[in-house]
């Protein structure tokens, strides 16, 4: 059987404080424990949750935790269930509330010599005791003219007189704590001889040169006095008016009339009522001069048919607040329908093309009227005037593809080539009317082109295939001057393309036929063994039926290619001595020799006194220094070819001879000594 070792018990608890209902169970097998509140399972929250088998309250709540708690233990296997004793909280709390008028029913009914009852809406458990205050001073129960009923939480004033006027508050305390009224009550019982407001002046806004009227009335017994003052404290009477208030009139009933109002009349007017007793009552009202500013400009708007759009009209700053309305074609828009005004907004629902045009927002107040136009365009989907056509464009010439469309507003046209957007550059240009110009058509421009014409309403597109009519041309053009190595095999290629595959043949420029050892094989001129006589001018001729023929002239030179007779060697020289780097080359035409030292060409005209290049090509450097060390390259070149060879130069310190060495001992490496 399931047995409760600890059962929950009823207990006192404080609102908002911690509490714990204990429950401990012993059973033969595992059980699960849950809690009921008034018979319903308790769901865990951050405020109230199971802690083991017990129920923990982080903050007791007098509303959510009132009721009967019960701990239930269940053996889910056997189905046996045991229930603890019921437990509940005696929750102690106190809650602030306002001081309210209980009698009479409204403040307006409070008259001198009537009974006034106030109630303190502080509640709590256990019932708190109450203390009343007037203007912060405690009221004791035994005082004359009032009684305090703690049970009713009431303060009764009988009869109420002017001496009871003041701010009433209450506080209450119990075992739980203390609270004071959240809102206090101001009791005002007038003395008949005190001035009381009957009619207070209101702020006025008038247009320039119009009239303004302020009303003001007080009552008292005996009747009170009334005086008007303007901002600078100058009294206004029918006998003595300030200079800037010449057109002011004070009527017998207290009203003040100002005629032909000017900017200097704007400001605060004070109406002062004084009874036989009591303080003066000062009432203020402001005279504002009406004004209206200019309206901001509208940007033109583009809308699409079928959509719903709104245009907001920001009213200009003004006093009084300007009223706003919309007009179209001189007619004020209604407040409902398809095209209507809602607040300050122009609303166009299910826009039609016919809605396009100028709409005007008007704003007006006493100071005048302002207006601002907004131009509304209803966008249409573009339509074709001329679609791009499949075209044959000539290579090297400008090519044009049309894309002529019309719409409102003017459509924007973009072009794509092979699905890639064409950005305007030196080769492509899109004209204002949408036409694409290809400045100099190339073979690879032969592909698909697509143009898209768009407005906010939508877009249309079309594509066309471009076929490039290739011009007859050499690919690549043969080099006009070429060299062949004497006594060797040589080839001179010539190829061309055109709309039709061209025929290619070689001729000697003088018209003589090619010798038998020279063959023309599909445009490649082949020399089996070059002789001196093969030098000369040759012409490559490419031709086809539709395009005729083209010619390329080539001057062939026969040359003996360069070889080095003498090459510079790796050289080591003592500092201060002279270095000689020899270089001699042969070939036909006779090669020229240049030297490169430490990665720069040595210009013979700018060598200075230490360096010299001999006619035979050798380089001499006098008075060598360590910085002359490095690689030196001999470059031999003629009109047909170029060749180079290099060697390092080392500059070393001259060793001091040791006594053991004889004067004729050889250096440890190859040297040039001078």
């Amino acid at each position: 059987a399931i047995v409760f070792i600890k059962q929950p018990s009823s207990q006192d608890a404080l609102q908002g404080r911690r509490a714990l209902l204990r429950c401990e169970v012993e059973a033969p097998g595992p059980v699960h424990v849950y809690w009921l509140l008034d018979g319903a399972p308790v769901q865990d929250t951050e405020r109230r949750f199971a802690q083991g088998s017990s129920l923990s309250f982080a903050a007791v709540d007098r509303l959510q935790d009132s009721g009967t708690f019960q701990c239930v233990a269940r053996d889910d296997v056997t189905g046996e269930e045991a229930r603890s004793a019921n437990a509940s909280f005696n929750i102690k709390w106190i809650e602030a509330g306002p001081v309210v008028l209980k009698h009479p029913a409204s403040e307006a009914e409070i008259q001198p010599q009537t009974q006034v009852t106030l109630r303190c809406h502080i509640d709590g458990h256990p019932r708190p005791t109450y203390q009343w205050f007037r203007d912060g001073t405690p009221l004791s129960d035994g005082q004359s003219n009032h009684t305090v009923s703690s049970k009713e939480r009431n303060l009764t004033l009988r009869p109420a007189g002017p001496e009871h006027s003041g701010l009433y508050s209450c506080c209450a305390h119990s075992a739980f704590g203390q609270a004071c009224s959240s809102q206090n009550f101001t009791l005002s019982i007038a003395d008949e001889s005190f001035a009381r407001v009957v009619l207070a002046p209101q702020d006025v806004v008038v247009a320039r040169y119009e009239e303004a009227m302020f009303h003001c009335q007080f009552s008292a017994q005996p009747p009170p006095s009334l005086q008007w003052l303007f901002e600078d404290e100058t009294p206004i009477t029918n006998r003595s008016r300030p200079p800037h208030l010449r057109r002011a009139t004070v009527f017998a009933n207290g009203s003040l009339l100002l005629t032909q109002v000017r900017p200097r009349n704007a400001g605060i007017y004070r109406c002062i009522g004084q009874g036989q007793r009591g303080p003066p009552i000062i009432l203020e009202a402001t005279l504002h001069l009406a004004e209206i500013e200019d309206m901001p400009l509208f940007e033109p708007r583009v809308f699409t048919a079928g959509s719903e759009e709104r245009v907001t009209c920001l009213p200009p700053k003004g006093l009084p607040e300007p009223s706003v309305w919309w007009e179209h074609a001189g007619v004020r828009l209604p407040t409902h329908g398809r095209v209507y005004q809602k607040g300050h907004e122009l609303v166009l629902a299910n826009i039609a093309e016919s809605d396009a045009g100028v709409y005007t927002c008007h704003a007006a107040n006493l100071a005048g009227q302002r207006r601002q136009d907004v131009n509304i365009t209803v966008a249409t989907v573009p339509s074709w005037l001329k679609k791009p056509q499949d075209s044959q464009l000539e290579e090297g010439k400008p090519g044009y593809l049309d894309c002529l469309t019309q719409a409102t507003p003017k459509p924007t046209v973009v072009w794509y080539r092979n699905q890639m957007l064409i950005s305007e550059d030196s080769r492509f240009e899109v004209f204002k009317n949408g036409t694409l110009r290809i400045n100099s058509v190339e073979v690879y421009d032969g592909t698909w082109y697509r143009c898209m014409s768009s407005t906010p309403a939508g877009s249309i597109e079309a594509q066309a295939r471009v076929q490039v009519l290739e011009k007859l041309k050499f690919t690549p053009p043969p080099q006009p001057q070429q060299c062949m190595e004497f006594d060797k095999e040589a080839t001179v290629p010539c190829s061309a393309t055109g709309r039709e595959k061209p025929t290619i043949k070689w001729e000697r420029a003088d018209g003589s036929s090619l010798p038998e050892w020279v063959t023309d094989n599909a445009g490649t001129l082949h020399f089996a063994r070059v002789t001196r006589d093969d030098a000369g001018n040759y012409t490559c001729i490419a031709s086809n039926g539709p395009q005729g023929q083209i010619r390329a002239h080539v001057q062939l030179t026969v040359a003996v290619f360069i070889t080095f007779k003498v090459e510079p060697e790796r050289t080591t020289v003592y500092q201060g001595h002279t270095a000689l780097l020899q270089c001699e080359a042969q070939g036909d035409p006779k090669p020229l020799i240049q030297w490169k030292g430490k990665d720069r060409i040595l210009d013979p005209t700018k060598l200075g006194p230490r360096m010299h290049i001999f006619q035979n090509g050798s380089l001499v450097i006098h008075d060598v220094a360590p910085e002359d060390s490095g690689r030196y390259t001999c470059i031999a070149g003629n009109s047909c070819n170029i060749k180079h060879t290099e060697a390092p130069l080392y500059v070393v310190d001259k060793p001091v001879p040791e006594e053991s060495e004889g004067p004729g001992s050889p250096p440890p490496y190859k040297m040039i000594q001078t």
Epitope: P30, Y34, G39, P41, G79, E80, A82
Partner: antibody
């Protein structure tokens, strides 16, 4: 001997009502929770509801409103009242005490 | 509405195999452990195997074991025996005295 016996099953027309009984022997219902579980032909087990030791009842969301569990402790019997029956209510209905002790089940067929 | 999902729905295995069935709940079970496993054979009432996630019911062989917490649980049969071919159900208890079954896992001979 502790055992549960269901009864009251049978053929009923769509829209009709039926009351199943589960008679317990060998223990007192007032100390135990009793479950009703059903199983449609060829389908899985489906929990219907529970009545706890105090007589409070709790139901699967689909059973609320149409099905009612009650008990008579003097007869040591638990009941399942089924109203507005539909063809999809056709199943073997089991009563069970806790997880361990199950009845043999009773077949309810809803068909016109 | 609480949903308990078993996987796989069907499982073919051989005698001696290790078999794992998982059960996932759409919300945590009460106390994170109020979960049971049943075995059912055709025409019979379900038989309790495991209760409170991992406790073996009386008379159930030790090759059956359960584990998990919160909303994810597993039933393991360490070495399948001929008598173990049946349908298995998980069964969860939730706050508010609400219970639910998984849709079942049918274990068949490979």
């Amino acid at each position: 001997e502790v055992q549960l016996v269901e009864s009251g099953g049978g053929l009923v027309q769509p829209g009709g009502s039926l009351r199943l009984s589960c008679t317990a022997s060998g223990f007192s219902l007032s100390n135990y929770v009793m479950n009703w579980v059903r199983q449609a032909p060829g389908k899985g087990l489906e929990w219907v509801g529970i009545i706890d030791s105090s007589g409070s009842t709790y139901y699967a969301s689909w059973a609320k409103g149409r099905f009612t569990i009650s008990r008579d402790t003097s007869k040591n019997t638990v009941y399942l009242q089924m109203n507005s029956l539909r063809a999809e209510d056709t199943a073997v209905y089991f009563c069970a005490r806790g997880l361990y002790l199950w009845g043999q089940g009773t077949l309810v067929t809803v068909s016109s | 509405e609480i949903v308990m999902t078993q996987s796989p729905s069907t499982l073919s295995a051989s005698v001696g195999d290790r078999v794992i069935i998982t059960c996932q709940s759409s919300q945590s079970v009460y106390n994170n452990n109020l979960l049971a496993w049943y075995q059912q054979k055709p025409g019979k009432a379900p038989k309790l195997l495991i209760y409170y996630t991992s406790n073996l019911a009386s008379g159930v062989p030790s090759r059956f074991s359960g584990s998990g917490s919160g909303a994810e649980f597993t039933l393991t049969i360490s070495s399948l025996q001929p008598d173990d071919f049946a349908t298995y159900y998980c069964h969860g208890g939730y706050n508010g005295n609400i219970y639910a079954f998984g849709q079942g896992t049918k274990l068949t001979v490979l």
